[in-house]
């Protein structure tokens, strides 16, 4: 950066090098160049010479004033016009930053995705700060009082093996940058209550043409959790509104769910599950598309294609005509 240059004087910022966006700031430049009484001192921002709001304070020092500074980052340097020098002489440079103190982190959520071996904690960080902001996740055992801290810039994965203070914990998030510090409320968790079953997948669909045609959706999960509650939502791709069916599920075998659907229409299906009575749902599964047959008296078996959407930490799912994220508490 510009701060690595060799200086013949120095440059400083008031109130500070990192300051709140929208503030009035002053940048001072003081020359210390051998055999040079500067005729003029110049300021440059991102390589462009500034022409206004420059005040000469004394023989060696000048001030540049900015009102309502709104740029997140700028590289400043100043130069001197020395007698008997054809070119301007570089005095010094500094990178400056503006931004905001962090908001109070809220919506702190911790879940354990089955088989992951990790507890994943996320939160809403609030408005963009524009400056480097670090987050410290505190995990404190309600049984032993031992506290672990984890430094991160976004979410955190904490190995469940490191949670050796029993099953009950408090989790809170501390946000800090050069402009301030804030802290979330404390979230109380029980490790057994935050497990999300392993992903549920719709594998195939089958339409049986009878007097009333019937579609069977086959779906499964590798979960070892015994009591699981699931929801399957479905709609015609041309519709805005979802229909939802609820199931109490035992995944010792592949699930088969029956639907009576309109003929010759393309449908979208998604499923999600939770451990019965617990807080958190899976994200909705990848969209599964199935077109029902026209009403012809025969049996057809058909595997329909999956859409290869990302089904990562937060999964986008089509709701009422816009994208929503659905792995929150119900």
């Amino acid at each position: 950066g510009i701060t690595n240059i060799n200086c013949s004087g120095h440059i400083w910022v008031e109130p500070a090098t990192i300051f709140k966006m929208g503030m009035n700031i002053s940048i001072y430049c003081q020359a210390a160049i051998k055999n040079c009484q500067p005729r003029q001192l110049h300021f440059y921002k991102n390589g462009i010479k500034e022409r206004f709001e420059i005040t000469r304070i004394n023989k060696t020092t000048a001030r540049l004033w900015y009102k309502n500074f709104l740029e997140p980052h700028a590289s400043m340097y100043c130069t001197a016009e020395c007698p008997n020098h054809f070119q301007e002489t570089l005095i010094c440079g500094k990178d400056i930053s503006s931004g905001y103190p962090p908001d109070v982190p809220d919506e702190v959520t911790c879940v354990i995705y089955e088989y992951s071996g990790n507890m994943t904690c996320t939160w809403n960080a609030g408005k963009l700060t524009y400056v480097d902001t670090k987050y410290v996740v505190h995990v404190k055992s309600l049984e032993t009082e031992e506290e672990q801290q984890y430094l991160t810039s976004s979410y955190i994965n904490i190995s469940t093996d490191s949670l050796q203070g029993g099953k009950k914990y408090l989790v809170w998030v501390q946000a800090e940058n050069a402009l301030g510090m804030e802290e979330s409320k404390q979230l109380q968790i029980h490790l057994d209550d935050i497990v999300i079953p392993s992903a549920s997948i719709i594998s195939r669909a089958e339409t049986i043409n009878a007097t009333v045609p019937k579609t069977i959706i086959y779906w499964d999960s590798q979960t070892t959790i015994e009591k699981v509650s699931c929801e399957m939502r479905y709609k015609a791709t041309t519709n805005q509104t979802w229909n939802v069916k609820e199931f109490d599920t035992n995944f010792t075998y592949v699930q088969q769910s029956e639907f009576y659907l309109e003929p010759n229409i393309k449908y979208i299906f998604q499923v999600r599950c939770q451990e019965t009575g617990k807080r958190y749902w899976q994200a909705w599964s990848s969209p599964f598309f199935h077109k029902t047959t026209e009403t012809v008296p025969q049996v057809t078996s058909k595997s329909s294609q999956h859409n290869t959407w990302n089904s990562g930490l937060t999964v986008a799912s089509i709701s009422t005509g816009h994208l929503t994220s659905d792995n929150r508490e119900d």
Epitope: V136, T144, E145, E147, Q148, Q149, L151, Q174, M181, E183
Partner: antibody
């Protein structure tokens, strides 16, 4: 058994600075732990100054009255925690204790013997 | 979080049952400790996690409470128990607005 020994106390003029040391033995310095500073003015109650948390990263916490004037740091190679006190005032006259449980809990099983700081002209 | 301890002073006799209370300004779960301090000495941990007895502390000392209201009880006062007692919240110190984590103290003196 954890042992804490404070040093560095003494007489200092108002506006002056002082650095107190707390040498610790018996702590596993590779584990997570809190080391805290507490003071007690003559005839008064216990007053928390701040703590340093040492784990996968280092964090410091201060009472809001101590922010800006007091700084806690540590030197792992010397198993020592420091309290740097600046712009001292007469009301900072107190016995200063370091305290810990040798782990990442915030109650204090172990206390130093205390070191007296007197701020006076 | 503010810790309010009461009473600030208390006179009692050997053999008496004594109760000291401590109130937190917000929920601190069971994260509360009690200390005993004698003149010229460092404080000594008596109780942690609201009700757990520290090593070497006589069983006549007991603690109770959770959330915001806590109690230290000495079931039968002994001569060596006359001292000053402090409560301390041990929930979290990362909050930017903490002034003190200790209560103001309760001075227990001999009656008469």
């Amino acid at each position: 058994e954890v042992q804490l020994v404070e040093s560095g106390g003494g007489l200092v003029q108002p506006g002056g600075s002082l650095r107190l040391s707390c040498a610790a033995s018996g702590i596993d310095f590779n584990s997570n732990y809190y080391m805290c500073w507490v003071r007690q003015a003559p005839g008064k109650g216990l007053e928390w100054i701040g703590c340093i948390y040492v784990g996968s990263h280092v964090n410091t916490y201060y009472a809001n009255w101590a922010k800006g004037r007091f700084t806690i740091s540590r030197d792992n190679s010397k198993n020592t925690v420091y309290l740097q006190m600046n712009s001292l005032r007469a009301e900072d006259t107190a016995v200063y204790y370091c305290a810990t449980s040798g782990s990442s809990v915030l109650y204090f099983k172990f206390w130093g013997q205390g070191t007296l700081v007197t701020v006076s002209s | 979080i503010q810790m309010t301890q009461s009473p600030s002073s208390l006179s009692a006799s050997v053999g008496d049952r004594v109760t000291i209370t401590c109130q937190a300004s917000e929920n601190i779960y069971s994260f509360l400790a009690w200390y005993q301090q004698k003149p010229g000495k460092a404080p000594k941990l008596l109780i942690y996690s609201a009700s757990k007895l520290a090593a070497g502390v006589p069983s006549r000392f007991s603690g109770s409470g959770s959330g915001t209201d806590f109690t230290l009880t000495i079931s039968s006062l002994q001569p060596e128990d006359f001292a000053t007692y402090y409560c301390q919240q041990t929930n979290r110190y990362s909050n930017p607005d903490i002034y003190n984590v200790f209560g103001q103290g309760t001075k227990l003196t001999v009656l008469g």
